[in-house]
């Protein structure tokens, strides 16, 4: 039975040209995290594997940095980066947990972080 929950940074906003950290945290389970996949809509951004470490998709290498932790840092943000991001936690023995983050990249200097929220 899957008992864990994914806590994410929720709905967040950031300025164009700036950077943002996407963070998810898996709690309420003793399952071992074997791999975390980060996706932007339908696009694989990066993989963090417990044994092999990080793999950043080559097409994002210039603007995506691993970490901190299992999170992902997006740099040189553009308006086109606005959208949904998913952290997919592959665990043993539980299976797969998915968290969702919505990022809005703003033209103005008014960019506030949304409240943290949980996805069961």
């Amino acid at each position: 039975m899957m008992t864990g929950t994914i806590e994410t940074t929720g709905n967040i906003s950031a300025e164009k040209g700036g950077s943002i950290i996407l963070q998810c945290h898996l709690s309420s389970t003793t399952a071992q995290v074997t791999q975390v996949n980060w996706e932007q809509q339908d696009q694989l951004l990066a993989i963090c594997n417990a044994d092999l470490g990080w793999h950043i998709s080559p097409s994002f290498k210039d603007r995506v940095a691993p970490g901190p932790g299992l999170g992902l840092t997006l740099q040189s943000l553009t308006v086109n980066d606005t959208g949904e991001y998913f952290c997919i936690y592959h665990t043993y023995p539980d299976g797969t947990y998915t968290g969702r983050i919505f990022l809005e990249v703003l033209e103005s200097s008014v960019a506030e972080h949304g409240a943290r929220f949980q996805i069961p």
Epitope: N37, L44, L52, S57, S59, H90
Partner: antibody
Amino acid sequence: EVQLLESGGGLVQPGGSLRLSCAASGFTFSSYGMTWVRQAPGKGLEWVSAISGRGSSTYYADSVKGRFTISRDNSKNTLYLQMNSLRAEDTAVYYCARTPYRSGWADYWGQGTLVTVSS
Amino acid sequence: DIQMTQSPSSLSASVGDRVTITCRASQNIKTYLNWYQQKPGKAPKLLIYAASSLHTGVPSRFSGSGSGTDFTLTISSLQPEDFATYYCQQTYSIPQTFGGGTKVEIK
């Protein structure tokens, strides 16, 4: 240099058994998932089975479930495929391949070993 | 199971030609799509992974694109050593499945 070397293929009668081996070298074997893929004569590729780096998770195609067992011995850097209740339609070249990431790609392949099931 | 449909099943082309092979998934597989090259009597070789990433050592004339259900492998200028059979593979879900293959032959 990554190397994968399959062995154990041969001629077997329907209903018989075979155990294929895949000896790995040139990388930290226990850190990588491994996969078996087969190819019937003149046909395309068919995914057969996969196993995680530590062997805790295994996966099978419906066509072999309950008959084939994938396993690994990380102390020997060797992957296995135990094939029981073999059928004529299992006749194929069997390849082992290294899969670096879960839901990932097979980046290095062995040369294959031929299994022929015939009476 | 996710069905992978490749087209064409075979094609004839000349050295220097631009060649495009398509692969369609029966459902959304995001970018969990790989391309392999296989020559007769040899093991497959990885060309492209995650839809568009070029595997180490693969010539830059090979490129991949697409996401969701529709994917393309392009060889920008066909070379003599490129005559082979090409397969797409989805690794989005178990069982992983391959397309039926595209045989690229000399015209």
